[in-house]
Amino acid sequence: TQNKALPENVKYGIVLDAGSSHTSLYIYKWPAEKENDTGVVHQVEECRVKGPGISKFVQKVNEIGIYLTDCMERAREVIPRSQHQETPVYLGATAGMRLLRMESEELADRVLDVVERSLSNYPFDFQGARIITGQEEGAYGWITINYLLGKFSQKTRWFSIVPYETNNQETFGALDLGGASTQVTFVPQNQTIESPDNALQFRLYGKDYNVYTHSFLCYGKDQALWQKLAKDIQVASNEILRDPCFHPGYKKVVNVSDLYKTPCTKRFEKKLPFDQFRIQGTGDYEQCHQSILELFNTSYCPYSQCAFNGIFLPPLQGDFGAFSAFYFVMKFLNLTSEKVSQEKVTEMMKKFCAQPWEEIKTSYAGVKEKYLSEYCFSGTYILSLLLQGYHFTADSWEHIHFIGKIQGSDAGWTLGYMLNLTNMIPAEQPLSTPLSHSTYV
């Protein structure tokens, strides 16, 4: 049945999320005659590309074509052949490529050039590859979750089955955690957005939204870990780093050259008397938490209120969807339930981090050790970021919903990006016939 024209009149779109740690391809589908309705686009496939993020191919760009092949071939199978030529393909690269561009614009261009060459060889309507801004990443994530939750229209079919009991018309805030950056986006209540860089105005489906957004580059979970290691090794007395964010008994050798490869560790760079150092885990949540807090500079704020590093943050308002690594990490730790209080999460993290590494390896034998070893840090980092970074409290924690998918579509920026680029979010509430519309982000 593959590659046969479908009887119903449907359209497809493809978005590749070129993240810092990996690339994922998403295929979306919608009824052609309902392009302007809210909630009609849904994800039919996610294909995770095998290998690291595209920024890691900087010294081996000729391998990018092969790297993308499997998922692009999967798209060829899923989408009927008759639809190939009219199916748009977009690639958005996020913070991993932002960091590479900071190091060298020429190297970032080289990677994107080969990505564009490779993707344009497929029979789809390739629309280009680009590094999206942190502001776009936050905005499109916010659009995605609110579109899927039916927040942009009274006509939605989802309210009866979306498991979040909330005031129907209040939008959700979006909390996105990646490997290299993290985004916070929400509509503040009657609050002036004091920093123009953090203000977005949308008119969607006949309603105006004044949205706050910020992307913290270098504060994704992987780059935050590199930052923490670079900070801690500065004051180590020798090449042994006793690290409370890793399980007791865990050992790992780190190359100093790898530590200082990223622009995120530049502020901690120091000439060290060794080329390698050894991490020895001690598994102490409280100490790990304290070490992480040193990454957040809260001593300076030129606004009425800040998150950290002098970045304006209005008072938190309403419910929040926390997705991407917020969800994956908390899901692994079994802490995504709405019923788990912040105190309970902290207590569980303390227990988890204190478990010996050998015990952890046995309990989670199917999980790659590289990932498994970092859940203690990642979980602690999530708590630190949400509580001290963004000022959630034990009470407002109840308003954080850890979301992987909504109605079968992944929460993340890709759907919002495609909706915008295909002009499928009208400014005004659609009538029975589709209206003309333009781009909003």
Epitope: V61, N62, I64, G65, E106, D109, R110, L112, D113, V114, E116, R117, S118, S120, F126, Q127, G128, R130, I131, T133
Partner: antibody, heavy 120, light 113 residues
Framework: QVQLVQSGAEVKKPGSSVKVSCKAS????????ISWVRQAPGQGLEWMGG??????NYAQKFQGRVTITADESTSTAYMELSSLRSEDTAVYYC???????????????WGQGTTVTVSS | GIVMTQSPDSLAVSLGERATINCKSS????????????LAWYQQKPGQPPKLLIY???TRASGVPDRFSGSGSGTDFTLTISSLQAEDVAVYYC?????????FGGGTKVEIK
């Protein structure tokens, strides 16, 4: 100053293949995206494909019939067109640039052109 | 792919007069990341390869006389020769390098009236 020097004119039979070379001098070849453009007699310019950083790509019209390669050791790019027909009679040019990222200034250096005549 | 449409097909202008060539793309070639239009203009004289005149829609390539100027954004572009000289007799092509496949306009032949 980069220069592109192409191989000489060719006369080919229908169904055969032709391989045109384009040698670069005076620049770092590995960082040059090279495009191939053809021009039939009295007609306009038509982009066939290009290569940059080891990866080639082709216009849909020529997919499966054209192969673009590059040999960094000799700073030479090649364009091979197979299953030739009379409509392939044209001047074939190589040019530096054309890619959005690596060739952001357009095609700024051109070879002198290679005339390929396909005739039985 | 993006279709490039040039007008007019040919143009006869007196020496010293202004020549204007239009180019329209079937979709925008303005790249939001850097606010640049990925459009170039070329001049081709008989028996010669094309020569780059303008890139990024309005930036003159090195050595190009300032009587040549490019303007426009998004989908509509113009090449202007402010004061036509005898050596400007040629065919002029616009080309987008925003998306693969790269595409050229059909060309505009400029002659002296």
């Amino acid at each position: 100053q980069v220069q592109l020097v192409q191989s000489g004119a060719e006369v080919k039979k229908p169904g055969s293949s032709v391989k045109v070379s384009c040698k670069a001098s005076g620049g770092t070849f590995s960082s040059l995206p090279i495009s191939w453009v053809r021009q039939a007699p009295g007609q306009g310019l038509e982009w066939m494909g290009g290569i940059g950083f080891g990866t080639a790509n082709y216009a849909q019209k020529f997919q499966g019939r054209v192969t673009i390669t590059a040999d960094e050791s000799t700073s030479t790019a090649y364009m091979e067109l197979s299953s030739l027909r009379s409509e392939d009679t044209a001047v074939y040019y190589c040019a530096r640039g054309g890619a959005k990222y690596a060739g952001r200034y357009g095609m700024d250096v051109w070879g002198q052109g290679t005339t390929v005549t396909v005739s039985s | 792919g993006i279709v490039m449409t040039q007008s007019p097909d040919s143009l006869a202008v007196s020496l010293g007069e202004r020549a204007t060539i239009n180019c329209k793309s079937s979709q925008s070639v303005l790249f939001s990341s850097n606010n640049k239009n990925y459009l170039a203009w070329y001049q081709q004289k008989p028996g010669q390869p094309p020569k780059l005149l303008i890139y990024w829609a309005s930036t003159r390539a090195s050595g190009v006389p300032d009587r040549f100027s490019g303007s426009g954004s998004g989908t509509d572009f113009t090449l202007t020769i402010s004061s036509l000289q005898a050596e400007d007799v040629a065919v002029y092509y616009c080309q987008q390098y925003y998306l693969y496949p790269l595409t050229f306009g059909g060309g505009t032949k400029v002659e002296i009236k």
